[in-house]
Interface confidence: low
């Protein structure tokens, strides 16, 4: 039975130019975790992995960051970057669990972080 | 805040055992490797093992396999290293180390001195 | 076992100086080396992990890079609280291995 649940950075918005911090956490499950992706849409961002730690994604590799923790740093966002992602936790024994982060990259400085929710 | 408190100092004669611990908090215990590491004058930093917490699952460096045994307490949240037929060549301090694709956070050290 | 030679083993330099420490992997790594900073009270700080991926809260004063099998941790100005000893790990394959340390003092 999956008795955890994912805490993400909810909804949240950030200015063109900048960067930003994507950030989610498994609680309440004593599962393994064995690797982390992060994706956006039906692209590959990121992978960490926990003999080998990260990776990134060629195509990524000059705009994203791996960390802080199992999080990812976006940075240099433009309108395009506006669009859910996805933290996809692969543990043992439970399976996957799945977090929703909505960005959206505005034009002027009304960026404002969103409040935190829960996915079970 | 991720935390690993090691137990004290340890003071034991030669052929004897020691039972080192590492209590974390923080984080979900299981879903973490838990590392242990050896940092002595002669040999500088060495690898002693590795625990899956979430199984009890261990990898040794062979060079440790007859000498540590790693175990852990997952109602406690307390990881554990026990070194046999101690020497003085146990003399160090030793080092427990959250691991999830790397070593992302170490306790404060246990120093071992054996001497009769 | 994976041999890691780090060089040098002790380093005396000035504050601002730009310094740079070195390991030699003895196979092949692929870029999983972390470097980490070890103070005198015997606190151990993780601050490149993947090569040069800085963790979260080390200053951009430090960077790492790899030239083949060898791997650099550069301090491009250095600062008070940088003198300490550091090392390499490698963590490819079991056993991880460290190289024996840099003592970087303050001259």
């Known amino acids: 039975m999956m008795t955890g649940t994912i805490e993400t950075t909810g909804n949240i918005s950030a200015e063109k130019g900048g960067s930003i911090i994507l950030q989610c956490h498994l609680s309440s499950t004593t599962a393994q975790v064995t690797q982390v992706n992060w994706e956006q849409q039906d692209q590959l961002l990121a992978i960490c992995n926990a003999d080998l730690g990260w990776h990134i994604s060629p195509s990524f590799k000059d705009r994203v960051a791996p960390g802080p923790g199992l999080g990812l740093t976006l940075q240099s966002l433009t309108v395009n970057d506006t669009g859910e992602y996805f933290c996809i936790y692969h543990t043992y024994p439970d399976g996957t669990y799945t977090g929703r982060i909505f960005l959206e990259v505005l034009e002027s400085s009304v960026a404002e972080h969103g409040a935190r929710f829960q996915i079970p | 805040e991720v935390q690993l408190q090691e137990s004290g100092p340890e003071l034991v004669k030669p052929g004897a055992s020691v039972k080192i611990s590492c209590k974390a908090s923080g984080y979900s215990f299981t879903g973490y490797y838990m590392l242990w590491v050896k940092q002595s004058h002669v040999k500088s930093l060495e690898w002693i093992g590795r625990i899956n917490p979430y199984n009890g699952a261990t990898t040794y460096n062979q060079n440790f396999k007859d000498k540590a045994s790693l175990t852990v307490n997952k109602s406690s949240s307390t990881a554990y290293m026990e070194l046999h037929s101690l020497t003085s060549e146990d003399s160090a301090v030793y080092y427990c180390a959250r691991w999830f694709g790397d070593f992302d956070f170490w306790g404060q050290g246990t120093t071992l001195t054996v001497s009769s | 076992d994976i041999q890691m030679t780090q060089s040098p083993s002790s380093l005396s330099a000035s504050l601002g100086e730009r310094v740079s420490l070195t390991c030699r992997a003895s196979?092949?790594?692929?870029?999983?080396l972390s470097w980490l900073q070890q103070k005198p009270d015997g606190t151990i700080k993780r601050l490149i992990y993947?090569?040069?991926t800085l963790d979260s809260g080390v200053p951009k004063r430090f960077s790492g890079s790899r030239s083949g099998s060898d791997y650099s941790l550069t301090i491009s100005s250095l600062e008070s609280e940088d003198f300490a000893d550091y090392y390499c790990?490698?963590?490819?394959?079991?056993?991880?291995?460290f190289g024996s340390g840099t003592k970087l003092e303050i001259k």
């Open positions: 790990l490698q963590y490819a394959s079991y056993p991880f291995t």
């Open positions: 196979q092949e790594i692929s870029g999983y």
């Open positions: 993947a090569t040069s």
